[in-house]
Interface confidence: low
């Protein structure tokens, strides 16, 4: 049976197409291509007589096309005009006809998309973003990519107009992009530039930095307050509630204890109207922040009860600080026998006896800190005394 | 001449001027680049770099997307090539993406 | 400076003095033009830039690499930490052998 086959069957716009012929009969008297799908002389594109090996060109004929002899038909340099059915015509010698159809579709080359958007500039969590992919064409695929990647599922993401438009319901700042669009059809794919939001948000609660709360005298006191935003904040620093500078950082040298105090950044951005503050507290002491692990030290750890004495000793290199005993985490002293000496540094037991057995610690402190000894074990024994008649104890 | 007073221009196109900052870069003959500081062109407020406090004034001109350096009391040793570049604008603060070709200052007596 | 053949591949280092949270970014600059960002935050290839170019690193550490060398690779190459403000690194002058 006689068929045609068209290679490609899309077509790029300007390029060409074969209709390609199957099973053409062998005595043959000629064929005629008629555009459409069925034989109508208005319509011919191209007759051929196999006798004169003539081409006569119909009222169809636009001189791009080509026939040979094996019945196939070239079109050249096509247009979406071309796009449609083709009917071949074959006239054998018994004057008997058969006929086939085929089709093609042109498809244009997409030129590089571009990606408009009614609002570049949006305010976070507050605006919704469009962004159109241009030009709208006909027969196109549109697809949308952010940061390289296909469009996640989200709520926040509506596509609509056929997928050519993509809407960012309340942004965030996260959706900066880049954004691109790609049309496609069968023939072409483009992408566009890629496109960016910028997001206007914030400022976020500050964070002032250093950590540090507490300054020894004469310390430079240099702080920096930063806030997620943009545009970028405008800070200004309160101390105690009275406004001092509208700097991002603030510096105070050879502080004193009169520097003590709460420290407000206050962190505004002028186009979302938001204002953030944080307030920090700064300590400027001559005791330390941070007091050393004290050392404990004992006369002896293994004593006889009620006959020997021990003494325990605290050691520390801090100054400005206090000592205090613990024994089984009850506070000393806690008996008579108990005595603190030399600033409580050192624990005296007179005489030791079995309860007195145990763990010992010390700890020492200022109002802003303290710090624990590891502790120290007492062992107390006691020596059996021989009975007269030579009986041990029982 | 040493003891004058040069300015020099730096006009963006093609994006929104109020959006990137803009720094400025100095390359002193046979040396390599130098980050003079930056303006927010959003808010006018200038950033020096340490080197560039004192003679160094950034300006702007935001209806013209403007950008301008102003080199007080020359020195010898600011004749340079000076370069506007446009801070990058990214999730994240980017560097400078795009740069001016340069403007050459020449200081002689 | 650093010399190197046509088609061969060339890498440059750069150490920062603490911890940059990887913001490094690489330039290309050409003698009368405006230095060209290739690369930001760390590996992040600009738009246009072709894929012979890349770069890593974390921490202090950093590397950019050229492959596949052509003539007009020849530049001077600079890092740029922008963590803390910006600091620019030395200039690497690259030469074709």
């Known amino acids: 049976q006689l068929t045609t086959e068209s290679m490609p069957f899309n077509v790029a716009e300007g390029k060409e197409v074969l209709l390609l012929v199957h099973n053409l009969p062998q005595q043959l008297f000629g064929y005629s291509w008629y555009k459409g799908e069925r034989v109508d002389g208005n319509r011919q594109i191209v007759g051929y007589a196999i006798g004169t090996q003539q081409a006569t060109p119909g009222p169809a004929n636009s001189g791009r096309e080509t026939i040979y002899p094996n019945a196939s038909l070239l079109i050249q340099n096509v247009t979406q005009n071309d796009t449609g059915f083709y009917t071949l015509q074959v006239i054998k010698s018994d004057l008997v006809n058969e006929e086939a159809t085929g089709q093609f579709h042109v498809y244009p080359e997409l030129p590089k998309p571009s990606i408009s958007s009614n609002n570049s500039n949006p305010v976070e969590d507050k605006d919704a973003v469009a962004f159109t992919c241009e030009p709208e064409t006909q027969d196109t695929t549109y697809l949308w990519w952010i940061n390289n990647q296909s469009l996640p599922v989200s709520p926040r993401l509506q596509l609509s107009n056929g997928n050519r438009t993509l809407t960012l319901l309340s942004v965030t700042r996260n959706d900066t992009g880049p954004y691109e669009c790609e049309i496609q059809n069968p023939v072409s794919a483009n992408r566009s530039d890629p496109v960016t939001l910028n997001v206007t948000y914030g400022p976020d609660t500050p964070t002032i930095s250093p950590s540090d709360t507490y300054y020894r005298p004469g310390a430079n006191l240099s702080l920096s307050c930063y806030a997620a935003s943009n545009p970028p904040a405008q800070y200004s620093w309160l101390i105690n509630g009275t406004f001092q500078q509208s700097t991002q950082e603030l510096f105070i040298p050879n502080i004193t204890v009169n520097n003590s105090g709460s420290y407000t950044c206050h962190a505004n951005n002028s186009v979302t109207g938001c204002n953030r503050t944080t307030v920090k507290t700064i300590i400027v002491t001559e005791l330390s922040p941070v007091v050393a692990k004290p050392q404990i030290k004992a006369s002896k750890t293994t004593v006889t009860g009620d006959k020997d004495s021990v003494n325990l000793t605290c050691s520390t290199n801090d100054t400005g600080i206090s000592i205090r005993w613990f024994f089984k985490n009850q506070s000393l002293p806690s008996s008579e026998r108990m005595k603190l000496s030399q600033g409580n540094t050192t624990l005296s037991i007179n005489p030791v006896k079995r309860e007195d057995a145990g763990t010992y610690w010390c700890e020492v402190f200022n109002p802003i800190s303290k710090n624990q000894s590891d502790p120290i074990m007492l062992n107390v024994n006691y020596n059996a005394l021989p009975q007269e008649n030579g009986l041990s104890p029982g | 001449k040493p003891g004058e007073t040069v300015k020099i221009s730096c006009k963006a196109s093609?994006?929104?001027?109020?959006?990137?900052?803009m720094n400025w870069v100095k390359q002193a003959p046979g040396k390599d680049l130098k980050w003079m500081g930056w303006i927010n062109t959003y808010t006018g407020e200038p950033t020096y770099a340490d080197d560039f406090k004192g003679r160094f004034a950034f300006s702007l001109e935001t209806s013209a997307s403007t950008a301008y350096l102003q080199i007080n009391n020359l020195k010898n040793e600011d004749m340079a090539t000076y370069f506007c570049a446009r801070k990058a604008f990214y999730r994240y603060d980017g560097g400078m993406d795009y740069w001016g070709q340069g403007t050459s200052v020449t200081v002689s007596s | 400076s650093l010399s190197a053949s046509l088609g061969g591949k060339v890498t440059i280092t750069c150490k920062a003095s603490?911890?940059?949270?990887?913001?490094l970014a690489w330039y290309q600059h050409k003698p009368g033009k405006g230095p060209r960002l290739l690369i930001h935050?760390?590996?992040t290839l600009q738009p246009g830039i072709p894929s012979r170019f890349s770069g890593s690193g974390s921490g202090r550490d950093y590397s950019f690499s050229i492959s596949n060398l052509e003539p007009e690779d020849i530049a001077t190459y600079y890092c740029?930490?922008?963590?803390?403000?910006?600091?620019f690194g030395g200039g690497t002058k690259l030469e074709i052998k």
């Open positions: 603490q911890d940059i949270n990887k913001f």
């Open positions: 740029l930490q922008y963590d803390n403000l910006y600091t």
């Open positions: 093609g994006y929104t001027f109020t959006v990137y900052g």
């Open positions: 935050y760390t590996s």
